[in-house]
C-alpha cells in the first residue's frame, strides 16, 4: 500500500530509506539507488535522519557540484540551501559529499568508497 | 513532519515491526518501563539481519534479555532461554544485555544506556 516501504527499507515520516552496509563509490551508489527506483538521499533538513543521529558512519548523498550553475545541486536539480551545511563554501568542488546523520558533511573523492542512503518519498 | 503508516508518529518501520529509537539513556529497568508505557517491548532481536540493521541505526542499546545472576541462564522478556552468545557473561556483575555494534554484550543493569522499543505489526 502507499504507506509501506519495500522489504529491508526503513520507513520514517512518509519517506522510505535504504541504508547500505556495503561501501561503494559515489557513482556506483547513484546507480544502485536508481536501480531500486529511488535516488541518493536528498536532505530537507539536518534532522531528517534523526532516527540514526547516533550513527558514526558517513553515507554518500545525492549532492554534486555543477560547473554550469557554479552551485552544489541535488539530483533533482535543486540547489543546496546554504543553511544545511555551514561549511559547504569550503568544499572541494571536484568531490562528492558524504553525510553523517548527526548533521555533519565531508567532501571526499567520488572514487572513495562509502556507505550510501537511497530515498523514496511515499506520498 | 508528515505522518504515514502503521507505526506511532516519530517511530520507524522496518520488516513488519515498529521501532522507537531512543536518544535518552536509562537503566535497563527504566528502559523496560519506558517501553511498556509506549505500549511496546524493550528491543528484542529475532535474527542476525535485524541485529545488523539495528547496529547501523545506533551503536549501542539495551535489549530485552537478562538473567537473575551469573548462575542463571539468559532469558528473554517472555521467559524463554536466549540462544545467542552474549560476551563477558562470566562477569557476575553484568546481568543485562546490550546490543553493541553487531554483537551482544552483558552490562551492569544499573548503567545508563540508550534504549529502543519495538512492537510487531
Amino acid at each position: 500500500d502507499c504507506c509501506s516501504c519495500q522489504e529491508k527499507w526503513v520507513g520514517y515520516r512518509c519517506n522510505c530509506y535504504f541504508i547500505s552496509s556495503e561501501q561503494k563509490t559515489w557513482n556506483e551508489s547513484r546507480h544502485l539507488c536508481a536501480s531500486q527506483k529511488s535516488s541518493l538521499l536528498q536532505l530537507q533538513n539536518t534532522d531528517e535522519l534523526d532516527f540514526m543521529s547516533s550513527s558514526q558512519q558517513f553515507y554518500w548523498i545525492g549532492l554534486s557540484y555543477s560547473e554550469e550553475h557554479t552551485a552544489w545541486l541535488w539530483e533533482n536539480g535543486s540547489a543546496l540551501s546554504q543553511y544545511l551545511f555551514p561549511s559547504f563554501e569550503t568544499f572541494n568542488t571536484k568531490n562528492c559529499i558524504a553525510y553523517n546523520p548527526n548533521g555533519n558533511a565531508l567532501d571526499e573523492s567520488c572514487e572513495d568508497k562509502n556507505r550510501y542512503i537511497c530515498k523514496q518519498q511515499l506520498i | 513532519a508528515r505522518h504515514c503508516g502503521h507505526c506511532p508518529e516519530e517511530w520507524i518501520t522496518y520488516s513488519n515491526s515498529c521501532y522507537y529509537i531512543g536518544k535518552e539513556r536509562r537503566t535497563w529497568e527504566e528502559s523496560l518501563l519506558a517501553c511498556t508505557s509506549k505500549n511496546s517491548s524493550l528491543l528484542s532481536i529475532d535474527n542476525e539481519e535485524e541485529m545488523k540493521f539495528l547496529s547501523i541505526i545506533s551503536p549501542s542499546s539495551w535489549i530485552g534479555v537478562f538473567r537473575n545472576s551469573s548462575h542463571h541462564p539468559w532469558v528473554t522478556m517472555n521467559g524463554l532461554a536466549f540462544k545467542h552468545e552474549i560476551k563477558d557473561s562470566d562477569n557476575a556483575e553484568l546481568n543485562c544485555a546490550v546490543l553493541q555494534v553487531n554483537r551482544l554484550k552483558s552490562a551492569q543493569c544499573g548503567s545508563s544506556i540508550i534504549y529502543h522499543c519495538k512492537h510487531k505489526l
Partner: antibody, heavy 118, light 107 residues
C-alpha cells in the same frame, strides 16, 4: 602512486622574492586543490593558502595575503608558491600538499627550505 | 581564527605502551579535526581525518576520538617507527589552523 616533488633549497637575500615549485605525479592537479603550508624552525605548521588549479581560484590565510601568491600550471601538473619582500620571518620549510578533502591534507611534498639571510 | 592547543609539547613512552595525545580547540569544531605525523626527517603524513576516520594505509593501532573542543589521538601499542611529532589541525573554519605539536620520544 601519489607523489609531490618540490624544488630544492633556496638561500635568498632580505627584500628579494622566491618562487618554489611542486610537481605532482600519480594524479591530475586539476582534480583537486593544492595547498601550501609553512613550518618555521622548531615551530608548528601554518596554512598559507590553496588553489583550485582547474580555474585558478585561490584562498589565503589573511596573514599571508600580499606575502604569498599561489599559481599553478596544469600543463606541467605543477603548483607554485611565490613569496615576496622576504624577511628573516620567512625562513622556513614550505610544504606543498594535495588536499583530497577540502579540510584535510592527504599527501605532502618533502618540503623546501627557504633561508633568508644577508 | 580558531586556536588549536596541544598542551603537552613532549611525551616519553616505552615501546608497547598505549599513548594518548590531546588537542583543544578555542571553539567547537564539530569533529572537523585531523591528525598528522611528522618524522624527524621532516616527512609528514595524514593519520586521521574528521576525528576518527583512518586515512588509507595507516595502521589500526592509531585511533582518534573527541567532540566539541576536546580531541585525542591514541596509539594503542607504541612501535619504534611511531617516534615523531604529532600535530592536530582543525578543518571547520578557514583559515585552517594547526596545534603546536607533541613530540613523542622513547623512554
Amino acid at each position: 602512486e601519489v607523489q609531490l616533488q618540490q624544488s630544492g633549497a633556496e638561500l635568498v637575500k632580505p627584500g628579494a622574492s622566491v618562487k618554489l615549485s611542486c610537481t605532482a605525479s600519480g594524479f591530475n592537479i586539476k582534480d583537486t586543490y593544492m595547498h601550501w603550508v609553512k613550518q618555521r624552525p622548531e615551530q608548528g605548521l601554518e596554512w598559507i593558502g590553496r588553489i583550485d588549479p582547474a580555474n585558478g581560484n585561490t584562498q589565503y590565510d589573511p596573514k599571508f595575503q600580499g606575502k604569498a601568491t599561489i599559481p599553478a600550471d596544469t600543463s606541467s601538473n605543477t603548483a607554485y608558491l611565490q613569496l615576496s619582500s622576504l624577511t628573516s620571518e620567512d625562513t622556513a620549510v614550505y610544504y606543498c600538499v594535495y588536499g583530497r578533502g577540502s579540510a584535510w591534507f592527504a599527501f605532502w611534498g618533502q618540503g623546501t627550505l627557504v633561508t633568508v639571510s644577508a | 581564527d580558531i586556536q588549536m592547543t596541544q598542551t603537552t609539547s613532549s611525551l616519553s613512552a616505552s615501546l608497547g605502551d598505549r599513548v594518548t595525545i590531546s588537542c583543544r580547540a578555542s571553539q567547537d569544531i564539530s569533529n572537523y579535526l585531523n591528525w598528522y605525523q611528522q618524522k624527524p626527517d621532516g616527512t609528514v603524513k595524514l593519520l586521521i581525518y574528521y576525528t576518527s576516520r583512518l586515512h588509507s594505509g595507516v595502521p589500526s593501532r592509531f585511533s582518534g576520538s573527541g567532540s566539541g573542543t576536546d580531541y585525542s589521538l591514541t596509539i594503542s601499542n607504541l612501535e619504534q617507527e611511531d617516534i615523531a611529532t604529532y600535530f592536530c589541525q582543525q578543518g571547520n573554519t578557514l583559515p585552517w589552523t594547526f596545534g603546536g605539536g607533541t613530540k613523542l620520544e622513547i623512554k
